[in-house]
């Protein structure tokens, strides 16, 4: 999906209002320096691409993020503020339902959510006047 035509400010508002708090809850008890941020993004569409990938694509050691509250709210925000996004996700959602697993918060998941926080931070505050 091409995130170029999303309403970035509306997504930012949704993040600051609710999603960020859910990420904090998920990470509670974890030190901010515990993980090194290795994923980065260069602009807002790229940030959303990376956020979608980390939030919804199962990875080795962390298959369960898509069912978390922050993930569901992220999905809702993208569906509302990114034209045509919902349609592209129908097949992915059906596939996900088939492999629903027991929720386990692994260290790998905590690391992944730490990366997500960095991506969201970048998405929210790009330095718009590039020199």
């Amino acid at each position: 999906y091409d995130f170029t035509n999303c309403d970035f400010e509306k997504i930012k508002a949704a993040y600051l209002s609710t999603i960020s708090k859910d990420l904090i809850t998920y990470m509670s008890g974890t030190k901010s320096t515990e993980f090194n941020n290795t994923v980065s993004c260069s602009n807002r569409p790229h940030c959303l691409t990376e956020i979608q990938s980390l939030t919804f694509n199962p990875t080795a050691g962390c298959a369960s993020l898509a069912k978390e509250m922050f993930a569901m709210k992220t999905k809702a925000a993208l569906a509302i503020w990114c034209p045509g996004y919902s349609e592209t996700q129908i097949n992915a959602t059906q596939a996900m339902k088939k492999r629903r697993k027991r929720k386990v918060t692994t260290n790998k998941c905590l690391e992944q959510v730490s990366q997500l926080q960095g991506l969201w931070r970048r998405f929210n505050r790009p330095l718009l006047k590039q020199q």
Epitope: E9, K10, A13, L16, T33, R122, N124
Partner: antibody, heavy 120, light 111 residues
């Protein structure tokens, strides 16, 4: 502990340049916007610009655009602010500051400040 | 540039009384229903410290006698019951539009 430690006070001649450093520790330096703010004696706060260490992208206050250069050294988690063509009105305390964890845009961690005095 | 104008420039309030500082922006600092206005406190010889973010949210570790309100162009910082340690200069800041700009500051003293 999250902190920013700045270099020491400087006394400079008009027309010269000054380079102030800001060493970060306790957080992943490359993923936070780093800002520079100055405060002339008895005056208010003035934003100079910001840099994103992840890729070196910058944003400058146009007032300073031709005289200020912001850089970072990711290997040492250090941000630098260089101000050229100094004049007496550049006498001020220069602060580096980190943007918050969540992208709200406020400055949650500040350096202790570096006093720069420009005098002939 | 968005110009931030604080009033008054200085304020003297008795201990235990309410202190109110206003900040007016030359144009709206709202975006998508959120107000991108922050308040800082600065004591002599120290860097500023965040008090309120996004107009009305209390910063971490800030006493609840501090509160913020407003939207659009008009914002208010209120200290419900002034304490001796609240003597400082207070600044508003908008971060909705580059360049980021601060108010000129309001000096708060004890009467």
């Amino acid at each position: 502990e999250v902190q920013l430690v700045q270099s020491g006070a400087e006394v400079k001649k008009p027309g010269s340049s000054v380079k102030v450093s800001c060493k970060a520790s306790g957080f992943t330096f490359s993923t936070y916007n780093m800002h520079w703010v100055r405060q002339a004696p008895g005056q208010g706060l003035e934003w100079m610009g910001a840099i994103y260490p992840g890729n070196g992208e910058t944003s400058y206050n146009q007032k300073f655009k031709d005289r200020v250069t912001l850089t970072v050294d990711k290997s040492t988690s250090t941000a630098y602010m260089e101000l050229s063509s100094l004049r007496s009105e550049d006498t001020a305390v220069y602060y580096c500051a980190r943007e918050d964890d969540y992208g709200e845009g406020y400055f949650d961690v500040w350096g202790q400040g570096t006093t720069v005095t420009v005098s002939s | 540039d968005i110009v931030m104008t604080q009033s008054p420039d200085s304020l003297a309030v008795s201990l235990g009384e309410r202190a109110t500082i206003n900040c007016r922006a030359s144009e709206s600092v709202d975006n998508s229903g959120l107000s991108f206005m922050h308040w800082y406190q600065q004591k002599p010889g120290q860097p500023p410290k965040l008090l309120i973010y996004r107009a009305s949210n209390l910063g971490s570790g800030v006493p609840d006698r501090f509160s913020g309100s407003g939207s659009g162009t008009d914002f208010t910082l209120t200290i419900s019951s002034l304490q001796a340690e609240d003597v400082a200069v207070y600044y508003c800041q908008q971060i909705n539009t580059d360049p980021l700009t601060f108010g000129q500051g309001t000096k708060l003293e004890i009467k």
